[in-house]
């Protein structure tokens, strides 16, 4: 039994890091493998993660961690029974993938303005809480070409757009994702999408 693709890990900079790897053949990850991880720290305790299958030869492990700080560094040991298959390390602050925003809502009752709001996925005491920026994706269910991205570079989790920038009388969907420049993170996953029917009064045209 050998590791074909070494574990790569990303952290949500809160309580979970996710490591993925591939074995050289079909593997029952949960019964055959264990990923041990330990904070490089005096007297720190070792933890064991039981991996799950992720495709035939792929494995994934969700490592539970205390709130992450930038100095944290973990040793990782991948075991198959008594055999050490791979040894490595992981610094969560250097491999951050933020949590996805939630509770995306489209408020259509403001006159001819669409107000999109969502929730910051972090509690106020987490470092990322005040460092997230967002991308909002809006698309038409009827027209695949009607697809747009709005970059929200301010901290408030909301976006206002004129309803007239979208076509009237058709349904749209929106979703939002986050990233943090401070840690040069990857983008989060997209939030679940939300749907609304866009309608507004066309301005009266005089001829």
């Amino acid at each position: 039994m050998k590791v074909l693709q070494e574990p790569t890990c990303v952290s949500d900079y809160m309580s979970i890091s996710t490591c993925e790897w591939k074995m050289n053949g079909p593997t029952n990850c949960s019964t055959e493998l264990r990923l041990l991880y330990q904070l490089v720290f005096l007297l720190s305790e070792a933890h064991t993660c039981i991996p799950e299958n992720n495709g035939g030869a792929g494995c994934v492990c969700h490592l539970l961690m205390d709130d992450v700080v930038s100095a944290d560094n973990y040793t990782l040991d991948l075991w198959a029974g008594q055999q050490l298959l791979w040894k490595g390390s992981f610094k969560p602050s250097e491999h951050v993938k933020p949590r996805a925003p939630g509770n995306l809502t489209v408020h259509t009752n403001v006159s001819d303005t669409l107000l999109l709001t969502w929730s910051n996925p972090y509690p106020p005491d987490n470092y990322l809480y005040n460092h997230l920026t967002y991308a909002v994706n809006i698309w038409s269910e009827n027209d695949p070409a009607d697809f747009r991205i709005y970059n929200v570079t301010y901290l408030e989790p909301s976006l206002r757009i004129a309803a007239s920038t979208l076509k009237s009388g058709i349904s749209y969907r929106a979703r939002v994702r986050a990233w943090a420049q401070c840690y040069n993170t990857t983008w989060s996953e997209w939030s679940p999408s939300t749907k609304w029917h866009n309608s507004y009064r066309e301005p009266f045209e005089q001829h």
Epitope: L39, F41, L43, E45, D66, A71, Y127
Partner: antibody, heavy 115, light 106 residues
Framework: EVKLVESGGGLVKPGGSLKLSCAAS????????MSWVRQTPEKRLEWVAS???????YYLDSVKGRFTISRDNARNILYLQVSSLRSEDTAMYYC?????????WGQGTLVTVSA | QIVLTQSPAIMSASPGDMVTISCSAS?????MYWYQQKPGSSPKPWIY???NLASGVPARFSGSGSGTSYSLTISSMEAEDAATYYC?????????FGAGTKLELK
């Protein structure tokens, strides 16, 4: 809820001995390193000894050879055997859950060394 | 051994003030821990691994720093924050504490 309760302190003459205990609950005791810390009457905090989850032990130089830290994982109890006591060992002794995760302290047990 | 020097030794602050307590290490450490102690009570873990708040600690507290320079900050002082604060290094044995900073209410 993590709980640490120290006991075993008391008044002892110089050169005497005591065995301090710390009863732990609310977490998997065997998985964590544990430590003893003391606070002198002048309110100075001083680390005394630690024991890892794998039973490795570490001591403050001034207590080496006189104090022994140990643990009973079956009963969830941390011990500190203190002997050849000196007046400078007079302090409130606290047990602590150590390691990288959130630390917890007990309420302490008082050791007074006096003739 | 690593010596921790806290400053100031004593300070007073009015309600609403921002308060910063410093802890300087004689050599570089990866993390700093902070404890709060009120008269007649045992020390309480307050901040661990530099910036994580212990359970029940109000969000007005924060910790920061790296290398040899660390600090505890209270964004807006409240009466209940009057106490003595100790820093501790967990970098190498022997584990050592600062002498404490006594924070009084003005």
């Amino acid at each position: 809820e993590v709980k640490l309760v120290e006991s075993g302190g008391g008044l002892v003459k110089p050169g005497g001995s005591l065995k301090l205990s710390c009863a732990a609950s609310g977490f998997t005791f065997s998985s964590y390193a544990m430590s003893w810390v003391r606070q002198t009457p002048e309110k100075r905090l001083e680390w005394v000894a630690s024991i890892s989850s794998g039973d490795s032990t570490y001591y403050l130089d001034s207590v080496k050879g006189r104090f022994t830290i140990s643990r009973d994982n079956a009963r969830n109890i941390l011990y500190l055997q203190v002997s050849s006591l000196r007046s400078e060992d007079t302090a409130m002794y606290y047990c602590e859950r150590s390691g990288g995760s959130a630390p917890y302290w007990g309420q302490g047990t008082l050791v007074t060394v006096s003739a | 051994q690593i010596v921790l020097t806290q400053s100031p030794a004593i300070m007073s602050a009015s309600p609403g003030d921002m308060v910063t307590i410093s802890c300087s290490a004689s050599s570089s450490v990866n993390y700093m821990y902070w404890y709060q102690q009120k008269p007649g009570s045992s020390p309480k873990p307050w901040i661990y691994r530099t910036s994580n708040l212990a359970s029940g600690v109000p969000a007005r507290f924060s910790g920061s720093g790296s290398g040899t320079s660390y600090s505890l900050t209270i964004s807006s002082m409240e009466a209940e924050d009057a106490a003595t604060y100790y820093c501790q290094q967990y970098h190498s044995f022997p584990l050592t504490f600062g002498a404490g900073t006594k924070l009084e209410l003005k």
